[in-house]
């Protein structure tokens, strides 16, 4: 944020007799006074361009990686497992989000110059990506739990059910992201670059807290608990039964979940601290405000980085993904068929045998 000088003729004239004693930093200040808080954000000019470079790299990696993942899954029609369908949706979510990164990058440098429509759409895609991501991972954990702990294929056999679950996830993600679509807009302030943020009039702070606590609970904490429960029991079953093959088959899924947590947990913890501070549970100070703002910026980069990491996990840990990719390359004559591994099967990351479906 650039330096600005708000020197006024007198404070009585500046406030026009308004009682602003209850206004708190940025979240409650009306748009025309957004730049008036005396706790100034620290200018981090260097970080601005570092962030743009990160965004550009993530954009390219995500575009390439997720496109390949979708291609491989769509090609392997025959042995496609339930988990593959979830991973296909996961790749789609990441791909859609990646498409918005150039806009976010530009806004880091010039402020929000794209107007309210793009502010709503791009913010919506970002939120939907996050929520659909964790909900899909929760569904994968339930699927693995049912397949390994209860040795059931009820979900795997009913393809329409899986499609319904995926559609429901997208619907629920849209619902959780709805506040962003309704309330985000371009906010113009004197001497400060325009910003894309929630504006709900005089009750902005209260609404923002409610609209942050609800999605954080249902969109992050609940799926997280589901995942911990399912994988806890799945791991216990695998260790007790000494199922080496299935244990290996879980590596990709565990890696996907672990990376998701490493990328999104820090951001959500900082967001929680920010929420506690804004709701006066912990005292707000200028120092804390600045530290939290910087932490939000840093941890948000981690979250954004997540959209390009899943394809890398599949490439380095998922044997079947590599095989599937090689198969596509061989079909199109880009590599010789002799270089294909002997056990190269069409499935992307899974095969079904007996009553369980193993994912690798």
């Amino acid at each position: 944020m650039e330096d600005f000088n708000m020197e006024s003729d007198s404070f009585e004239d500046f406030w026009k007799g308004e009682d602003l004693s209850n206004y708190s930093y940025s979240s409650t200040l009306p748009p025309f006074l957004l730049d008036a808080a005396p706790c100034e954000p620290e200018s981090l000019e260097i970080n601005k361009y570092f962030v743009v470079i990160i965004y550009a790299l993530v954009f390219l990696l995500s575009l390439l990686g997720n496109s390949l993942v979708m291609l491989v899954i769509l090609y392997s029609r025959v042995g496609r497992s339930v988990t593959d369908v979830y991973l296909l949706n996961l790749a789609l979510a990441d791909l859609l989000f990646a498409l918005t990164l150039p806009i976010w990058a530009a806004s880091k440098v010039n402020g929000w110059i794209f107007g309210t429509f793009l502010c709503k759409v791009v913010s919506l895609l970002k939120e939907v990506n996050f929520y659909s991501g964790i909900l899909l991972l929760a569904c994968i954990s339930v699927d693995r739990y049912l397949a390994i702990v209860h040795a059931t294929r009820t979900l795997t056999q009913k393809r329409y059910l899986v499609k319904f679950i995926c559609l429901s996830i997208w619907g629920l993600s849209l619902l959780l992201a709805l506040p962003v679509l309704l309330f985000r807009r371009t906010v113009y302030s004197s001497n400060v670059s325009p910003a894309c943020y929630e504006d709900m009039g005089n009750n902005t702070a209260n609404w923002r807290m409610l609209l942050r606590i609800l999605p954080q609970s249902f969109g992050f904490i609940v799926p997280l608990l589901i995942m911990l429960f399912c994988y806890g029991f799945t791991l216990r079953t695998l260790f007790k039964a000494h199922m080496g093959q299935k244990h290996r088959a879980m590596r990709v899924i565990f890696a996907v979940v672990l990376i998701f947590l490493l990328c999104w947990l820090p951001y959500n913890l900082v967001l929680l601290a920010d929420t506690l501070m804004r709701t006066q549970v912990i005292q707000e100070t200028c120092e804390r405000r600045n530290h939290i703002d910087r932490a939000l910026d840093a941890t948000e980069i981690l979250g954004i980085l997540h959209s390009c990491l899943n394809p890398l996990i599949y490439a380095f840990i998922g044997q079947k993904f590599r095989h599937g990719l090689l198969k596509i390359l061989a079909i199109h004559g880009l590599i010789s068929k002799d270089s294909l591994p002997k056990d190269s099967r069409p499935s992307f990351v899974g095969s079904s045998s007996g009553h369980t479906s193993t994912t690798l």
């Epitope: 330096d3 600005f4 000088n5 708000m6 020197e7 404070f11 602003l20 004693s21 206004y23 708190s24 930093y25 200040l29 008036a36 808080a37 005396p38 706790c39 100034e40 620290e42 200018s43 005292q283 707000e284 100070t285 200028c286 120092e287 405000r289 600045n290």
Partner: nanobody, 125 residues
Framework: KVQLVESGGGLVQAGGSLRLSCAAS????????MAWFRQAQGKEREFVAA????????KYSDSVQGRFTISRDNAKNTVYLHMNSLKPEDTAVYYC??????????????????WGQGTQVTVSS
């Protein structure tokens, strides 16, 4: 927590100038909104001027606007009050105050957590 020590007060002729300094000890001075208040004998403590954390925004009371200038040097942990064209009615004890929140401009003494001992400024006619 921050400790504040004012200096630079004294006796000055009407129309003269003075520069008050407020040295802060303690951490994170650059995160405090700083202000000057004054209290004349038998009167309430009144707001004089305030400055934002990085010094790019300032606020003044009507009575000192155009004559007084508040500034800060975060590297030296010091805030200054440059007083020009002094009048007899500027005679008071001048206090330095610090607000760790900075959520909004505060023009009453209740908005500031930390205070100095004060420095006497006397303007003779």
């Amino acid at each position: 927590k921050v400790q504040l020590v004012e200096s630079g007060g004294g006796l000055v002729q009407a129309g003269g100038s003075l520069r008050l300094s407020c040295a802060a000890s303690g951490r994170a001075f650059n995160y405090y909104v700083m202000a000057w208040f004054r209290q004349a004998q038998g009167k309430e403590r009144e707001f004089v001027a305030a400055i934002s954390t990085r010094g790019s925004m300032t606020k003044y009371s009507d009575s000192v606007q155009g004559r007084f200038t508040i500034s800060r040097d975060n590297a030296k942990n010091t805030v200054y009050l440059h007083m020009n064209s002094l009048k007899p009615e500027d005679t008071a004890v001048y206090y330095c105050a610090a607000d760790p929140r900075g959520s909004s401009w505060s023009f009453s003494s209740g908005g500031y957590d930390y205070w100095g001992q004060g420095t006497q400024v006397t303007v003779s006619s």
